[in-house]
C-alpha cells in the first residue's frame, strides 16, 4: 500500500482542516488508514483522524482544531496499521479556505432597490471576521447569458443594486462566497442560492 498523491490540507481558520490524498489503488480509508496530527512542541498524544473514502483510491479527513493562530504548525503522520506511509507538516494560516457565508436574503421591498444581505461565517473573536470580502453571483433562471458577479470589497455583508439593472418579470438566483486577502486565501464555497422574482415599475417614457 502506497500514497500516490500526498495529503494536501486546507483550514477554515476556525475549527476544521480538511486533508485529501490518493492511494495507489482502491482503499477502504476508514478501516485501513489513520491520519495522526499534533501541534509542534506538544508532548501529548497526537489526535487521530479517521478518513473517509473520496472516490475509489481517494481519502479525505476532517481534522478538528481549536483556537487557530497564525503560528500554528501541525505534524501529520499517515499510518496503515503499524506502517508509516507518509510524514509531513501543515501550517493552517498558509492554506486557508474560508467558510461559506450563510443566510443569504434578498429584500425586494426597498423602493426599486434590491438589498442582499448575508451572514459573516465567523464569530467576532476570529481573526477572519474583520478581513473577509465577498463576491455575489446573480443569474437568471431563464437566460444563461444573464450572469453577473458583484465584488463586495467593504466589510459589511450586504449589497445594494437597482432592481432596474436586472430584467423585470423574471426569476433570479443569487449566491455569495468569501475570501480574505490578508492570508491570501482561496475562495470559499458558494453559499446556498436564494431565489426571487424581480419586478419593478418601469419609468414612464417622455415623448
Amino acid at each position: 500500500m502506497k500514497v500516490l498523491q500526498e495529503p494536501t490540507c486546507v483550514s477554515d481558520y476556525m475549527s476544521i482542516s480538511t486533508c485529501e490524498w490518493k492511494m495507489n489503488g482502491p482503499t477502504n480509508c476508514s478501516t485501513e488508514l489513520r491520519l495522526l496530527y499534533q501541534l509542534v512542541f506538544l508532548l501529548s498524544e497526537a489526535h487521530t483522524c479517521i478518513p473517509e473514502n473520496n472516490g475509489g483510491a481517494g481519502c479525505v479527513c476532517h481534522l478538528l482544531m481549536d483556537d487557530v493562530v497564525s503560528a500554528d504548525n501541525y505534524t501529520l503522520d499517515l499510518w496503515a496499521g503499524q506502517q508509516l506511509l507518509w510524514k509531513g507538516s501543515f501550517k493552517p494560516s498558509e492554506h486557508v479556505k474560508p467558510r461559506a457565508p450563510g443566510n443569504l436574503t434578498v429584500h425586494t421591498n426597498v423602493s426599486d432597490t434590491l438589498l442582499l444581505t448575508w451572514s459573516n461565517p465567523y464569530p467576532p473573536d476570529n481573526y477572519l471576521y474583520n478581513h473577509l470580502t465577498y463576491a455575489v453571483n446573480i443569474w437568471s433562471e431563464n437566460d444563461p447569458a444573464d450572469f453577473r458577479i458583484y465584488n463586495v470589497t467593504y466589510l459589511e455583508p450586504s449589497l445594494r443594486i437597482a432592481a432596474s439593472t436586472l430584467k423585470s418579470g423574471i426569476s433570479y438566483r443569487a449566491r455569495v462566497r468569501a475570501w480574505a486577502q490578508c492570508y491570501n486565501t482561496t475562495w470559499s464555497e458558494w453559499s446556498p442560492s436564494t431565489k426571487w422574482h424581480n419586478s419593478y415599475r418601469e419609468p414612464f417614457e417622455q415623448h
Partner: antibody, heavy 118, light 107 residues
Framework: QVQLVESGGGVVQPGRSLRLSCAAS????????MYWVRQAPGKGLEWVAV????????YYTDSVKGRFTVSRDNSKNTLFLQMNSLRAEDTALYYC???????????WGQGTTVTVSS | DIQMTQSPSTLSASVGDRVAITCRAS??????LAWYQQKPGKAPKLLIS???SLKSGVPSRFSGSGSGTEFTLTISSLQPDDFAAYYC?????????FGQGTKLEIK
C-alpha cells in the same frame, strides 16, 4: 471532575532523596504530557520537568538535570518525580500539571511542599 | 535557555482601570506563550495560550497580544477578583521557562 493530587513532600537533609507522586483522575491520563513546576517561598514559578504522554520523551530544566528523574505509570494514572542529591535551593512547593491540547498547563494540583534543610 | 522578562514587577491600580503587563523573550518564540493568574495560596490558572487565545471560562476583559519577542496581557477594566500575580510562560523547543511574575495590587 478533573483532578491532580500531589503527595510525598516533606523535610529532608541536603544530599538525600525524595520521591513525589501525583495521582490523576477525571481525564485520560495516558493521552497527555505531564509537568512538574515548583515555586520557592515568596518566589515565582519555575518549570522543573516534563514527560510525554507515553514516557518516551523527558526534558528537564538545567538546574535539576542529572539529579531529578520524571516518570509515569499510565496503568495507575500516576506521575512521579524522583529527586536525588537534594540541595537547599530545591526547597519549594512542587506542583504537577497537565498539558493543554492547545499549549499551556490547564490543570494543576494543589502542590506538595519539599523542604531541604540540615 | 530562553529568558522571559516581565514588567513591571509590581503594578498598583484601581477597580475599573485598564492595565497592561509586558513579557519579553530573549529570542523569538513566535506565538508560543501562555499567561497565568495565581492567587495567594492557590495553584496558577491558565488564562491565555498561543499568545492571544482566551481559554474557555476566562472573562473577556482579559486579552493577549504580541508575537516574536514582545507580548502583552491586557485587562480592560479591573475587577476586585483580578488582583493577583500574573506569569507568562514560553514553550518553544521543549523548554518552558516562566517570567518572574507581576504582582497586581490595589492602589
Amino acid at each position: 471532575q478533573v483532578q491532580l493530587v500531589e503527595s510525598g513532600g516533606g523535610v529532608v537533609q541536603p544530599g538525600r532523596s525524595l520521591r513525589l507522586s501525583c495521582a490523576a483522575s477525571g481525564f485520560t491520563f495516558s493521552s497527555y504530557a505531564m509537568y512538574w513546576v515548583r515555586q520557592a517561598p515568596g518566589k515565582g514559578l519555575e518549570w522543573v520537568a516534563v514527560i510525554s504522554y507515553d514516557g518516551s520523551n523527558k526534558y528537564y530544566t538545567d538546574s535539576v538535570k542529572g539529579r531529578f528523574t520524571v516518570s509515569r505509570d499510565n496503568s495507575k494514572n500516576t506521575l512521579f518525580l524522583q529527586m536525588n542529591s537534594l540541595r537547599a535551593e530545591d526547597t519549594a512547593l512542587y506542583y504537577c500539571a497537565k498539558e493543554s491540547s492547545s499549549y499551556g498547563l490547564d490543570v494543576w494540583g494543589q502542590g506538595t511542599t519539599v523542604t531541604v534543610s540540615s | 535557555d530562553i529568558q522571559m522578562t516581565q514588567s513591571p514587577s509590581t503594578l498598583s491600580a484601581s477597580v475599573g482601570d485598564r492595565v497592561a503587563i509586558t513579557c519579553r523573550a530573549s529570542q523569538s518564540i513566535s506565538n508560543w506563550l501562555a499567561w497565568y493568574q495565581q492567587k495567594p495560596g492557590k495553584a496558577p490558572k491558565l488564562l491565555i495560550s498561543k499568545a492571544s487565545s482566551l481559554k474557555s471560562g476566562v472573562p473577556s476583559r482579559f486579552s493577549g497580544s504580541g508575537s516574536g519577542t514582545e507580548f502583552t496581557l491586557t485587562i480592560s477594566s479591573l475587577q476586585p477578583d483580578d488582583f493577583a500575580a500574573y506569569y507568562c510562560q514560553q514553550y518553544n523547543s521543549y523548554s518552558y521557562t516562566f517570567g518572574q511574575g507581576t504582582k497586581l495590587e490595589i492602589k
